[in-house]
């Protein structure tokens, strides 16, 4: 059979089963890709959007690895990646995605590795991904790369339908907490990268979930803003006994200022001000006590004023009662006139 043609701006190798369309200013996916392609690079172009049918079998029945990074993609539309039966690896990194359709992969995809480094900086794309994952369209996913996205929080339940996930990269974001993240369904998770975030403390709930993941052997927590107060006590205890954390000796406090630079593993309970109830900073406690005292004082003064003016208040109450009685008697009299048919004309023509 004659060799398949190579799209004009691209470079093809049948022996390597690879097509590269790199930095060619393409505005759409070339429609005439050779059927042998397993590895497709379309990077550094200006695609803008990826519509349904741009990539489809049977023409691309062998396509296993697809790199679409750095293409100025703003939208991946419903069905855009649905008809690729062999797709295992997808890189959408470095695209300013605003829309990632929950139906982009159709109902179910064989995808195993998904890279979205720097592609989820807009809320719409993140929520689209969350919907897509929760719908179970990527149940075969074993690697998910979400680094460098400026994420503050992950949508609740986002990781709930990923039973095959082995590697999760959340590094270089702005995550402040993991309270709403459930790791329980990630039974095959082996590595979790949370380095270069803004985590202040890991709560008991998160630590318990990690303890319950039998395959989880590599957790990276470096370069976070650990707050070394009483709330970190459980995390420190977990760190000391866990063999899951990479480079745990290097983890150090960022706050408060007096603790900055101190190694987490070398902290003692006595340094953490744990006499007060957990999770309430001592400065805040002092403020609440002071506020309570002020309110109590104001209440006492108010009662004292009432007590000292009790005669005046009694007289004032009597006056109000008399005024009310006079008012009510007026109403009572008018009611009686209106009720007597003989006095109806009188009542309507008088000022009573």
């Amino acid at each position: 059979q004659p060799p398949a043609a190579c799209p004009a701006p691209c470079e093809c190798s049948e022996a390597a089963k690879t097509v590269k369309c790199v930095n060619k200013n393409l505005t759409e996916v070339p429609p005439d890709l050779p059927p042998y392609v397993r590895n497709l690079f379309i990077t550094g172009n200006r695609l803008g959007r990826l519509p349904a049918g741009a990539l489809s079998a049977p023409r691309l029945a062998e396509l296993g690895s697809l790199n679409l990074s750095g293409n100025h993609l703003r939208a991946v539309e419903a069905g855009a990646l649905a008809a690729l039966p062999a797709l295992r690896q997808l890189d959408l990194g470095g695209n300013p995605l605003a829309e990632l359709s929950p139906l982009a992969f159709g109902r179910a995809s064989p995808l195993e590795e998904l890279a979205l480094r720097g592609a989820l900086r807009e809320q719409g794309a993140l929520l689209g991904l969350a919907d897509l994952l929760q719908a179970g369209a990527l149940r075969n996913l074993s690697r998910l790369e979400l680094a460098d996205n400026g994420l503050l929080l992950l949508p609740t339940g986002m990781l709930g339908a990923l039973p095959a996930l082995r590697h999760l990269d959340l590094s270089n974001n702005s995550l402040v907490g993991l309270r709403n993240v459930s790791f329980q369904g990630l039974v095959r998770l082996q590595s979790l990268n949370l380095s270069d975030n803004s985590l202040g403390v890991l709560r008991n709930g998160t630590l318990a979930q990690w303890r319950g993941l039998p395959a989880l052997r590599r957790i990276s927590l470096s370069h976070n803003t650990w707050v070394c107060d009483c709330a970190i006590e459980d995390m420190v205890a977990w760190l000391k006994e866990s063999d899951q954390v990479e480079g745990k000796e290097a983890l150090s406090c960022a706050f408060p200022e007096k603790m900055a630079g101190r190694a987490l593993l070398k902290l003692n309970t006595s340094e953490l001000n744990c006499s007060a109830p957990v999770d309430v900073p001592s400065q805040l406690q002092t403020s609440y006590v002071f506020l309570g005292i002020v309110l109590a004082l104001i209440g006492a003064i108010f009662l004292l004023v009432l007590y000292l003016n009790r005669k005046g208040i009694k007289k004032w109450m009597h006056n109000i009662r008399d005024a009310c009685r006079d008012h009510m008697e007026g109403y009572h009299y008018r009611y009686e006139i209106n009720a007597d048919p003989r006095l109806t004309n009188l009542s309507s023509n008088s000022d009573v």
């Epitope: 190798s13 049948e14 022996a15 390597a16 590895n39 296993g64 790199n67 690896q89 590795e113």
Partner: antibody
Framework: QVQLQQWGAGLLKPSETLSLTCAVY????????WTWIRQPPGKGLEWIGE???????NYNPSLKSRVTISVDTSKNQFSLKLSSVTAADTAVYYC????????????????WGQGTTVTVSS | EIVLTQSPATLSLSPGERATLSCRAS??????LAWYQQKPGQAPRLLIY???NRATGIPARFSGSGSGTDFTLTISSLEPEDFAVYYC?????????FGGGTKVEIK
């Protein structure tokens, strides 16, 4: 970790058929290229041919008329047959696999069998 | 068929020195080039693939560069275990071909 183990006859007479088998352990069999390479004594490496999961084959034109590579997916094995051997076919024969890492799409032969020395002599 | 020419055939150096090995293709192979190391009695070992990507477990002192027809393998500081024969190999066109090899020996 994927490993390859190969076996087959080491001593042949001219005009006989060389037959070698390579078994794949510890990894997926489908989706990869399976390759045979040989190295005559004191010389460089020569590519014989390869087969993929869909049983599509490619052979070195210099050997094409004599070579057959096949797979048995049920046993995770692939085989080499080279007919009408001569003394020039004396070499160490290696089986090898093309694997790779995430987001790198051209793979080198990163898994090799231990090699089988084949001598052709009358 | 694409012919790969390696130079020099032999490189005599001392441990700690820098080794620069060259591979030239008779026509463009894009970046579809790999480098292998082979020691006596052993199977080759993949060092570099796609011209510049280090294979799993390969030390950082090994680096590859080049595209098209000219490629280089550099060993920044030779260790005693690096003395071996090095082969380049292309996967741009069938048949796949290897270079003739460069032997790095102790001076």
């Amino acid at each position: 970790q994927v490993q390859l183990q190969q076996w087959g006859a080491g001593l042949l007479k001219p005009s006989e058929t060389l037959s070698l088998t390579c078994a794949v352990y510890g990894g997926s069999f489908s989706g990869y290229y399976w390759t045979w390479i040989r190295q005559p004594p004191g010389k460089g490496l020569e590519w014989i041919g390869e087969i993929d999961h869909s049983e599509s084959t490619n052979y070195n034109p210099s050997l094409k008329s004599r070579v057959t590579i096949s797979v048995d997916t049920s046993k995770n094995q692939f085989s080499l047959k080279l007919s009408s051997v001569t003394a020039a076919d004396t070499a160490v024969y290696y089986c090898a696999g093309w694997f790779g890492e995430l987001y790198h799409y051209y793979y080198g032969m990163d898994v090799w069998g231990q090699g089988t020395t084949v001598t052709v002599s009358s | 068929e694409i012919v790969l020419t390696q130079s020099p055939a032999t490189l005599s150096l001392s441990p700690g020195e820098r080794a620069t090995l060259s591979c030239r293709a008779s026509q463009s192979v894009s970046s579809y080039l790999a480098w292998y190391q082979q020691k006596p009695g052993q199977a080759p070992r993949l060092l570099i693939y796609d011209a510049s990507n280090r294979a799993t477990g390969i030390p950082a002192r090994f680096s590859g560069s080049g595209s098209g027809t000219d490629f280089t393998l550099t060993i920044s500081s030779l260790e005693p275990e690096d003395f071996a024969v090095y082969y380049c190999q292309q996967r741009s066109n069938w048949p796949l071909t290897f270079g003739g090899g460069t032997k790095v020996e102790i001076k």
